[in-house]
Amino acid sequence: ALLPAREATQFLRPRQRRAFQVFEEAKQGHLERECVEELCSREEAREVFENDPETDYFYPRYLDCINKYGSPYTKNSGFATCVQNLPDQCTPNPCDRKGTQACQDLMGNFFCLCKAGWGGRLCDKDVNECSQENGGCLQICHNKPGSFHCSCHSGFELSSDGRTCQDIDECADSEACGEARCKNLPGSYSCLCDEGFAYSSQEKACRDVDECLQGRCEQVCVNSPGSYTCHCDGRGGLKLSQDMDTCEDILPCVPFSVAKSVKSLYLGRMFSGTPVIRLRFKRLQPTRLVAEFDFRTFDPEGILLFAGGHQDSTWIVLALRAGRLELQLRYNGVGRVTSSGPVINHGMWQTISVEELARNLVIKVNRDAVMKIAVAGDLFQPERGLYHLNLTVGGIPFHEKDLVQPINPRLDGCMRSWNWLNGEDTTIQETVKVNTRMQCFSVTERGSFYPGSGFAFYSLDYMRTPLDVGTESTWEVEVVAHIRPAADTGVLFALWAPDLRAVPLSVALVDYHSTKKLKKQLVVLAVEHTALALMEIKVCDGQEHVVTVSLRDGEATLEVDGTRGQSEVSAAQLQERLAVLERHLRSPVLTFAGGLPDVPVTSAPVTAFYRGCMTLEVNRRLLDLDEAAYKHSDITAHSCPPVEPAAA
């Protein structure tokens, strides 16, 4: 085995000392004779030591002993001791006691033989064993006076060899992480939690991270155990972006032909049923009514025009009922209703005229007389020397209950090429030209158009009381929506509880899966803010899709084009959600089509207005938007623009 040089020297020195021993003893006897018993000169001392260094060391001190104790001849025992000690440079011992194994007297010098771990001439310097190859330690080497020892980093323990370290498995202690998962690591361990949770070392448990405090969402943030959801102002036309945190505009993904005709007059603009046009004719010269116009509608019922005086005098109303023209008239307080002619709500243009002759009224469709009614009197009524006639289009100047036969006055129809009293009508033309809301879509098809800016609502009852008196009433919500969407986000159908400001039920288009945080085009069925079922839909293909929803005690289904959607809740959760819905249905609820009122964005998965064509059937009854309790004026009740043809 090879030893470091320093250790080898230390090992050899005692052997060397033993070799000198005989010589040393002889030298001591020689010294006795020459310099203790006798007074010796320098030369004589040189002969004893046989070298200059020892002689040079000895002789000055020898003279000091003579000065101190007198010459050898005085026979002072102190002198003999003084001289005998002079050649032994280890007396008194110059070496460090702690670090010296032995002191070796040399010729005028000495050598300190150091213990292991010490060094220096006097063995007073600690040797740092750690400075070379870490003292042989695997991790930490601790130097100490004359020695060293190995230790390990936290999480490791020293092996039996005193040098190597081995990892401590903290996870072997079941209490290490408490409720959290323990993962052993080299020299350490980690307490792990599911995503959205953080480990609390004080509580030794996983605690939900409130991501909302980190300001992750651009608009509204809702924290949930282990997650969070961002919400955007749907009513403001916003939806979640791809990153599921920021908001972006809801943009049409299918272009509809929404171009309008400046030479047309839309009759369905005023949901209140009030006229879209009011004309006041006054003449000095007695005049008869002549009105002619082109007309187009899919609407089966509504008022085209009124002509005459106030409600108790003389007037006529030209209306549509069950798709056919109806004339209601009141002459001098006597009312009549006549209906005749073909069904004209086929959506094609036709020319309609009303002409007041001497003793009768003639109604024509495409120049063919469909009604000829004998009348006694004139529509222009004299008053203070002038003849007056009020003419209103798309409504009547009084309440519909005061008609001869009540009718829903709202008419989603279009008029063009109108001519009142054979006069040129620049007033209406000018007004219509600058007001696009008074204009009709250039082309329309059957359906109802939701422009993405409003809703309609109804007051419908979903509770059914069985015939057996005393039995519990049941409930049912069955919705069939025929949709041709223009945008990928929006509420199709919803129930709103005004008293609680809650959304008990909603069916909507959405372009992401909220829990999976995944962009995907879906139809969502939800009770309040909880999605019950989801179904994929190709929303931007320009085609008509059928969304069917059926909810009753114990079951909830969602279908898109005949394919059943996937449930998002457990059976127990479903029952709990349906119980919530039933509780709401026992109180007053309003049925919304195409959007929601101003509710918090967290009330339902979607709050945005629907854009596109849609007809709704609720509990096997087709909803007529003209019959709604309220309808946004931009929703067209019985017409929808077609999808724009793809550019060649």
Partner: antibody, heavy 116, light 107 residues
Framework: QVHLVQSGPELKKPGASVKISCKAS????????MNWVRQAPGQGLKWMGW????????TYTEEFKGRFVFSLDTSVTTSYLQISTLKAEDTATYFC?????????WGQGTLVTVSS | ETTLTQSPSSLSVSTGDRVTITCITS??????MNWYQQKPGKPPKLLIS???TLRPGVPSRFSSSGSGTDFTLTISSTQPEDFADYYC?????????FGQGTKVEIK
């Protein structure tokens, strides 16, 4: 479009008569009555009355009863105003205007000057 | 006969000024009031017809209000082309009657 074109200016002596015309076009003449309005120099407007273009029956305001006559020739869709025994105070611009209860369409006006 | 009292008879204004002309009737005429503008050598031009209805082509700086017996024509910011004579006309009853007129001149 509707046009009412009146005859040119007249200079007459007191006691003479004048007949001014108003030719209508661009609409069915008999559907609307014709009104006459006088405006004396630097003065305001005065409604004189009107004529029923269906029946030819005229109506005059109190101030213009007597020397003033409204007439028609439906074949040429023209209305006339004749003033007899002219006086200096008849000096004015006379306008025809189509009956709409109010007046939308006016003739350009005919200035009648009565001076000796 | 319904008489109309129009005021002021004349007023001098600068371009951009607001002008208000009033017409008071001797009887209640509902809203059967009309307003005309007349420039020298031209026939009157209908600005506003019954029911405070602004006529097609008339600038929106012209407006009217009133019902019953008190009526007002307002020019919100007078333009150079607005310097003219203005008349009110009631069409509630025969005989039809005009106001005496208001001359709007440049200051």
């Amino acid at each position: 479009q509707v046009h009412l074109v009146q005859s040119g200016p007249e200079l007459k002596k007191p006691g003479a008569s004048v007949k001014i015309s108003c030719k209508a076009s661009g609409y069915t003449f008999t559907n609307y009555g014709m009104n006459w309005v006088r405006q004396a120099p630097g003065q305001g407007l005065k409604w004189m009355g009107w004529i029923n273009t269906n029946t030819g029956e005229p109506t005059y305001t109190e101030e213009f009863k007597g020397r003033f006559v409204f007439s028609l020739d439906t074949s040429v869709t023209t209305s006339y105003l004749q003033i007899s025994t002219l006086k200096a105070e008849d000096t004015a611009t006379y306008f025809c205007a189509r009956d709409e209860g109010w007046f939308v369409y006016w003739g350009q006006g005919t200035l009648v000057t009565v001076s000796s | 006969e319904t008489t109309l009292t129009q005021s002021p008879s004349s007023l001098s204004v600068s371009t951009g000024d607001r002008v208000t002309i009033t017409c008071i009737t001797s009887t209640d005429i509902d809203d059967d009031m009309n307003w005309y503008q007349q420039k020298p050598g031209k026939p009157p031009k209908l600005l506003i017809s019954e029911g405070n209805t602004l006529r097609p082509g008339v600038p929106s700086r012209f407006s009217s209000s009133g019902s019953g017996t008190d009526f007002t024509l307002t020019i919100s910011s007078t333009q150079p082309e607005d310097f003219a004579d203005y008349y009110c006309l009631q069409t509630d009853s025969v005989p039809l009657t005009f106001g005496q007129g208001t001359k709007v001149e440049i200051k």
